[in-house]
Amino acid sequence: AMHVAQPAVVLASSRGIASFVCEYASPGKATEVRVTVLRQADSQVTEVCAATYMMGNELTFLDDSICTGTSSGNQVNLTIQGLRAMDTGLYICKVELMYPPPYYLGIGNGTQIYVIDPEPCPDSD
Amino acid sequence: AMHVAQPAVVLASSRGIASFVCEYASPGKATEVRVTVLRQADSQVTEVCAATYMMGNELTFLDDSICTGTSSGNQVNLTIQGLRAMDTGLYICKVELMYPPPYYLGIGNGTQIYVIDPEPCPDSD
């Protein structure tokens, strides 16, 4: 499989935002790349978000996606927002080189994202 | 060394409080036990707090200590408070059986405590 590197641990901010870089070693000159973020918890794997982009262009996630991102060469800067403590888990970066053929697939080892829910602010009287 | 077990990772609450259990396998019937919490960051090790207790009695940390704790058999429940993001690091539990002789020492593998500073609450007008 294609090598994909991502940090082992990331802390979400108190606003529930976590950012990390997903870097892949491209065997060739791909023009179309697909990036998927998967969450693994209790041996269950679910898709968090996905985006396909043309090299040199911006990543475009769906409008209702909790992810945003930018790309630079073989690096993708991913940001996941709206995280709560219950979303703590292992977030795996999956990279696919879609075009031109041949197809290449790489899976990172995962980034453990820790999320702490903030204390509610006191009511203002 | 004597076996000492502690969790690999703990998240501090948004109030900067982290709790974890430090458990040791005593070779004999110690009556006086000393527990020390050490913080390792950038290969520097500093003492966070320490308490000596008689088996069956409560742990007593110094009045100005950031630690509190309770003991039950060979388990010590430790709580560290007042933590800030800059306090993120590896917290090592050191257990010494002080009395009766002989002296036994055990060092845990450390608990990585992650601390996230909360966002300030908006001023109430």
Epitope: - | H3, A25, P27, I92, P102, Y103, Y104, L105
Partner: antibody, heavy 115, light 107 residues
Framework: EVQLVESGGGLVQPGGSMRLSCAAS????????MNWVRQAPGKGLEWLAQ??????????YYSASVKGRFTISRDDSKNSVYLQMNSLKTEDTGVYYC??????WGQGTLVTVSS | DIQMTQSPSSLSASVGDRVTITCRTS??????LNWYQRKPGKSPKLLIY???NLASGVSSRFSGSGSGTDYTLTISSLQPEDVATYYC?????????FGSGTKLEIK
């Protein structure tokens, strides 16, 4: 009163075997890890072997200089620890001490390996 | 393995002098260090355990300090009966290596 009494030392030829014994009294033997330490003539102290107790599954540890030649064992019912020494070399000559986790020490027994 | 570097190898001091012996370890041993006194023809005697704790029955002239990789044995006021060889030892983990010893004499 705590007492550790070693026995079994003496003169042995190179390549030979010897078994040292250590009888303990005055403390709860089964609660302790037991060790053997030696001092060669004109040399410093050298830790040789350790045997832990039942809560630690009687794990054994050895220094590199004796591993594979010496075997430490214990009998909690007899409050005793032993050191079986095989393939002895002239450099194994010295006074052998048993110690309860370095707090209590015996008087030592002299082992001489010579032809 | 943890290496123990003890210094000096020998020293001569006068009665009443303050004497210090040092032990440096090759890695952090978290205070897992003992000090012993050995007189000719006698068994080693535990002086200090856990780097800083005075063993039962040992004179308060003896004290231990240090942490991490650097440890010190201090005799606050040397007495004639303190003539002996002193050893440090790693008690954190196997092998439980001793220092090479410091032979202490009276001037």
């Amino acid at each position: 009163e705590v007492q550790l009494v070693e026995s079994g030392g003496g003169l042995v030829q190179p390549g030979g075997s010897m078994r040292l014994s250590c009888a303990a009294s005055g403390f709860t033997f089964s609660d302790n890890w037991m060790n053997w330490v030696r001092q060669a003539p004109g040399k410093g102290l050298e830790w040789l072997a350790q045997i832990r107790n039942k809560p630690y599954n009687y794990e054994t540890y050895y220094s590199a200089s004796v591993k594979g030649r010496f075997t430490i064992s214990r009998d909690d019912s007899k409050n005793s620890v032993y050191l079986q020494m095989n393939s002895l070399k002239t450099e194994d000559t010295g006074v052998y001490y048993c110690t309860a986790q370095f707090a209590y020490w015996g008087q030592g027994t002299l082992v001489t390996v010579s032809s | 393995d943890i290496q123990m570097t003890q210094s000096p190898s020998s020293l001569s001091a006068s009665v009443g002098d303050r004497v210090t012996i040092t032990c440096r370890t090759s890695e952090n041993i978290y205070g897992g260090l003992n000090w012993y006194q050995r007189k000719p023809g006698k068994s080693p005697k535990l002086l200090i355990y856990g780097a800083t704790n005075l063993a039962s029955g040992v004179s308060s002239r003896f004290s231990g300090s240090g942490s991490g990789t650097d440890y010190t044995l201090t005799i606050s006021s040397l007495q004639p009966e303190d003539v002996a060889t002193y050893y440090c030892q790693n008690v954190l983990r196997s092998p439980f290596t001793f220092g090479s010893g410091t032979k202490l004499e009276i001037k």
